[in-house]
């Protein structure tokens, strides 16, 4: 089959802005440019270094990052958001997304929580101090929005199948995710429906075809009764808490 | 109102170089995906070639059939994708389109298209 | 790559009748819970015009005469009642995997 890219990925993450010219390899359905993941010779292509990868809202960035501006010795251009490590506890944030898994942004501070219950995206009220580097931290702050469309832009929000820049844009239990070359409303994952549990930093945030993160109240696990040889290719699926 | 417009069509010899424009108004330019399909005499629609939006680092694609010899581009401060097209041969002869996907995962807005002759 | 067989290459039809235009993909163009198939119409010396996307949902401005239904392999493209400005050709397009594909298009005429 061509549709040869990482297809079941729950971390909805964007791409380093163009290298270069366009890196096909000989066999390959498409040629994309550059550095995204697919395959050639039936071997996974992708880039062997970490890259920051910008990004307009959480959702785009991994269960263990959150997307705000570089701090000034960062690596990025003036103005991006790209997604950021999350913060430990006792550290300081502005919305639940920059704490790091199991914890929640209260009075400013990460904390620890037995319930992942909270929305990405969503902006601790009590806080009023800026967080230094962080001004833009606030989803979706400074990013362009569609006003120049047709007035079905201004009063709906996408179906399945619709452009989106940001999940905003979406209607409910739907989320904005990459499909190729675009931003697409795709179903927010139900119980039982695979996802998958990046490991590493670095480690995705190439997939071009991407799925949504898992419905409330669900967390991306392993699967106990799945078995496989190799530890890294284990099933993950959405479970209930 | 969105609105495509090419241009840069014509009669090119086997071997040569065109490059199309595609004037674009009406909309965000740079935060929207942007192609080129073509069309050969009385035969259907091909894609030729996609670059991102904004938000996804403008990324391009290719089919294997235009790859290495076309490159698409896009100036955001001018509203205008470009298509540079090399070493034509005669079955590139087409009309050439530019299309956008603005409100739906399709091509949702075309322009009218440019005629590209490759011919000796 | 993804192949797209419209069918029946042409119809001939009278206005007012039903037209069930059909396409079939050579392997699901279903993921994400979404059907990613659109159906355009094209008349002579224009530029084609989305009608549905995601299998069934319908393009700005588009009739309601105008409707696709469809899932997996098999799609069909439906337009109740035809009007003098249907008689066109139509195409139907996969977006599921790369490269996007489109199929030979169906050729609507008046009988």
């Known amino acids: 089959t061509l549709n040869s890219v990482l297809i079941n990925s729950n971390a909805i993450k964007n791409l380093p802005p163009p290298l270069g010219g366009a890196g096909g390899q000989p066999g390959s359905a498409v040629s994309v440019a550059p550095g995204v993941l697919y395959e050639g010779g039936n071997k996974y292509q992708t880039l062997d270094n970490y890259q920051p990868y910008p990004c307009a809202e959480d959702e785009e960035c991994g269960s263990d990052e959150y997307c705000s501006s570089p701090s000034r010795g960062a690596a990025g251009v003036g103005g991006v958001q790209i997604c950021l490590a999350c913060r430990k506890r006792r550290k300081r944030c502005m919305r639940h997304a920059m704490c790091c898994p199991g914890n929640y942004c209260k009075n400013g501070i990460c904390m620890p929580s037995d319930h992942s219950h909270f929305p990405r995206g969503e902006i601790e009220e009590s806080i009023i101090e800026n967080l230094g580097n962080d001004h833009n931290a606030a989803a979706g702050d400074g990013y362009p929005r569609r006003t120049t469309l047709t007035s079905k832009i201004y009063h709906t929000k996408g179906q399945e199948g619709s452009v989106c820049l940001r999940s905003s844009d979406c209607a409910a239990g739907l989320c904005c995710a990459r499909h190729f070359w675009s931003k697409i409303c795709k179903p927010v994952l139900k119980e039982g429906q695979v996802c998958t549990k990046h490991k590493r930093k670095g480690s995705h945030g190439l997939e071009i075809f991407q799925r949504c993160y898992c419905g409330e109240g669900l967390a991306c696990r392993i699967q106990k009764d799945h078995h496989q040889a190799s530890n890294s290719s284990r099933l993950h699926t959405c479970q209930r808490h | 109102e969105v609105q495509l417009v090419e241009s840069g069509g014509g009669l090119v010899q086997p071997g040569g170089s065109l490059r199309l424009s595609c004037a674009a108004s009406g909309f965000t330019f740079s935060s929207y995906a942007i192609s080129w399909v073509r069309q050969a005499p009385g035969k259907g629609l091909e894609w030729v070639a996609s670059v991102s939006g904004t938000g996804l680092g403008f990324q391009t694609y290719y089919p294997d059939s235009v790859k290495g010899r076309f490159t698409i581009s896009r100036d955001n401060a001018k509203n205008s994708l470009y298509l540079q097209m090399n070493s034509l041969r005669a079955e590139d002869t087409a009309v050439y389109y530019c299309a956008t996907s603005l409100e739906n995962y399709a091509f949702d807005y075309w322009g009218q298209g440019t005629t590209v002759t490759v011919s000796s | 790559e993804i192949v797209l067989t419209q069918s029946p290459a042409t119809l001939s039809l009278s206005p007012g009748e039903r037209a069930t235009l059909s396409c079939r993909a050579s392997e699901s163009v279903d993921d994400f819970g979404i059907s990613f198939i659109n159906w355009y119409q094209q008349k002579p010396g224009q530029a084609p015009r989305l009608l549905i996307y995601?299998?069934?949902k319908q393009g700005s401005g588009i009739p309601a005469r105008f409707s696709g239904s469809g899932s997996g392999t098999d799609f069909t493209l439906t337009i109740s009642s035809l009007e003098p400005e249907d008689f066109a050709v139509y195409y139907c397009q996969q977006l599921k995997e790369v490269p996007p594909t489109f199929g030979g298009g169906t050729k609507v005429e008046i009988k």
């Open positions: 995601a299998g069934s």
